[in-house]
């Protein structure tokens, strides 16, 4: 049986059940290389409490559809000797990066995971030439996830004192110059994740090979190498390489751009201080508030919730968007879709799409930006589920009793963007990270 998601085959992936202190290793095409789980384990559970390993999915007993992968075992999941066997079930959804498998829950018999990934899309529009896993768990099983930094088009310009060259990088994947052919990037070779521009020429100085690594709790490292043997004439016989170190700052701060810290014989060392390098619980919440010791800030958007069936309305030329954030109030137009953001076509009001659901909510505060994300909406033709990204700005004089109102700013590949000026986005900082 052919591997269902070949792009995901090159790596052993990790997921964590934080509640029970369990680390899962997943290899969807072969077997994980963990002796204690046996030679054919595709999903190996490492119980850190008891320091034991259990195979909860066998690579030989794999069954697959386009959106579901199941690994059975021969292990009875209760002690009564019935036919039920321990198994793992991975549900795949279309995403814009390779993404990460997320542990959902585990019953007595089944360990459930969900994975939003380009590998599950119906079309190839989000697929990279080369992409590597862009997250890591530290020794405390806390997740550090750089997926939000990945650019689907364009690149980051590295801060460098050299006026004759410009170094552009992407995070964990190659630079897509076709979708956003900026004048400087147009000459970058396909597959490069680190592109050096000198005058009108552009050179590949690194491609992603290995996934993100953690070197210390708050330092993550990504390495790019130039795959072809051909040397560049200005590298003194050395093969180019790029090392990017992502540093979680010691306290809350605005974002910075990547900085070149060392350069020698086409070996580039870059340091990037960004809160995305911090563990995810420091940045994100599933509710509409971020507060407490862990986050160093107090944010509460719950006063923006609308009651009594009313919604915020944002005009998007062809469409009207109805928004009801931070609550579970059904939007009248949206036909019981559990939508937090509802898209209605002006010319045909029967065309209604959920652009994100209220139980699929993430509030994120990172590098000085406050964002509320609703995902899991109705599918587009690519298979990607519509989502909405609301970028908040602090405005102490906002109208509507300080609440302000969302403004639609555009759509890219079924992701809808809004800005929202409100006094409730004014962040209160603590200082003990």
């Amino acid at each position: 049986q052919a591997a269902p998601f070949p792009e995901l085959c090159s790596y052993t992936w990790e997921a964590v059940d934080t509640k029970n202190n369990v680390l899962y290793k997943i290899n969807i095409c072969g077997s994980v290389d963990i002796v204690q789980c046996g030679p054919s384990s595709a999903v190996c559970m490492h119980d850190l409490k008891t320091r034991t390993y259990h195979s909860v999915g066998d690579s030989v007993l794999r069954s697959a559809t386009r959106s579901l992968l199941e690994f059975n075992t021969t292990v009875s999941c209760d002690q009564q000797g019935t036919n039920h066997r321990v198994q793992s079930s991975i549900a795949f959804l279309c995403g814009k990066t390779l993404g990460t498998p997320e542990f959902v829950t585990a019953t007595e018999c089944v360990h459930y995971f969900e994975w939003r990934t380009t590998a599950a899309c119906k079309k190839d529009i989000f697929k990279a030439n080369k992409e590597v896993p862009c997250y890591v768990f530290d020794e405390e099983l806390r997740k550090h996830d750089l997926n939000p930094l990945i650019k689907l088009s364009g690149a980051y310009l590295v801060d460098d004192s050299d006026p004759d060259t410009s170094l552009f990088i992407n995070v964990c994947r190659d630079i897509d110059t076709l979708r956003d052919p900026g004048s400087q990037l147009r000459a970058c070779p396909p597959g490069t994740a680190a592109c050096l521009v000198r005058g009108h020429q552009a050179f590949d100085v690194g491609q992603p090979r290995d996934g993100l690594k953690v070197v210390r709790k708050d330092r993550l490292v990504l390495s790019y190498v130039r795959e072809e043997a051909g040397k560049l004439d200005f590298c003194d016989g050395h093969s180019p390489a790029v090392t990017i170190t992502f540093v979680c700052p010691s306290e809350r701060r605005e974002g910075t751009i990547p900085k070149l810290t060392a350069k020698s014989n086409c070996r580039y060392e870059i340091e990037w201080i960004t809160e995305y390098a911090c563990h995810r619980d420091y940045l994100e919440s599933k509710t509409c508030s971020l507060s407490g010791e862990q986050q160093d800030v107090s944010i509460d958007l719950t006063p923006l919730a609308q009651s009594g069936g009313s919604s915020y309305i944002s005009d998007g030329k062809e469409y009207l968007f109805y928004l009801n954030v931070c609550g579970e109030t059904e939007i009248q137009f949206c036909n019981k879709k559990q939508a937090a953001v509802c898209q209605v076509k002006k010319s045909d009001t029967s065309q209604v799409k959920a652009a994100g659901r209220y139980h699929n909510q993430t509030l994120r505060y990172s590098d000085g930006f406050l964002t509320l994300i609703y995902f899991g909406g109705d599918e587009c033709s690519s298979g990607f589920q519509r989502m909405s990204v609301i970028n908040f700005e602090c405005n102490k004089t906002a109208g509507n009793d300080g609440k302000g109102t969302p403004v639609f700013t555009g759509e890219v590949d079924c992701t809808y963007f809004f800005t929202w000026d409100t006094e409730y986005a004014c962040v209160h900082h603590h200082h003990h990270h």
Partner: nanobody, 116 residues
Framework: QVQLQESGGGLVQPGGSLRLSCAAS????????MDWYRQAPGKQREWVAT???????TYADSVKGRFTISRDNTKNTVYLRMNSLKPEDTAVYYC??????????WGQGTQVTVSS
């Protein structure tokens, strides 16, 4: 106050059965994973079985197929049903509760002796 109390131990003949209980107080029981451990005289404490907060169960190879862990959230109690007991199962049995927000909590232990 957070507390675990084991009971149900005793003297049993080889091949016999026992059911140990571990009653919890002062914690949201259903949010915790529960583990049974045992310590035989002169030996290190060893893990026996786990019942995770979500419901999955795992067992040490030495007890697989003989022991069953279960819980009753209404009674805040976790059980260890032990069948086909062997002399090498003789030990003090401890239960442990753990969650991301609490330090591990141990009970005082209950003695199980398997002897003819």
């Amino acid at each position: 106050q957070v507390q675990l109390q084991e009971s149900g131990g005793g003297l049993v003949q080889p091949g016999g059965s026992l059911r140990l209980s571990c009653a919890a107080s002062g914690i949201i029981f259903s949010d915790n994973r529960m583990d049974w451990y045992r310590q035989a005289p002169g030996k290190q404490r060893e893990w026996v079985a786990t019942l995770a907060s979500y419901g999955w169960k795992t067992y040490a190879d030495s007890v697989k197929g003989r022991f069953t862990i279960s819980r009753d959230n209404t009674k805040n109690t976790v059980y260890l049903r032990m069948n086909s007991l062997k002399p090498e199962d003789t030990a003090v049995y401890y239960c442990k509760a753990s969650s991301p927000v609490l330090n591990d909590i141990w009970g005082q232990g209950t003695q199980v002796t398997v002897s003819s």
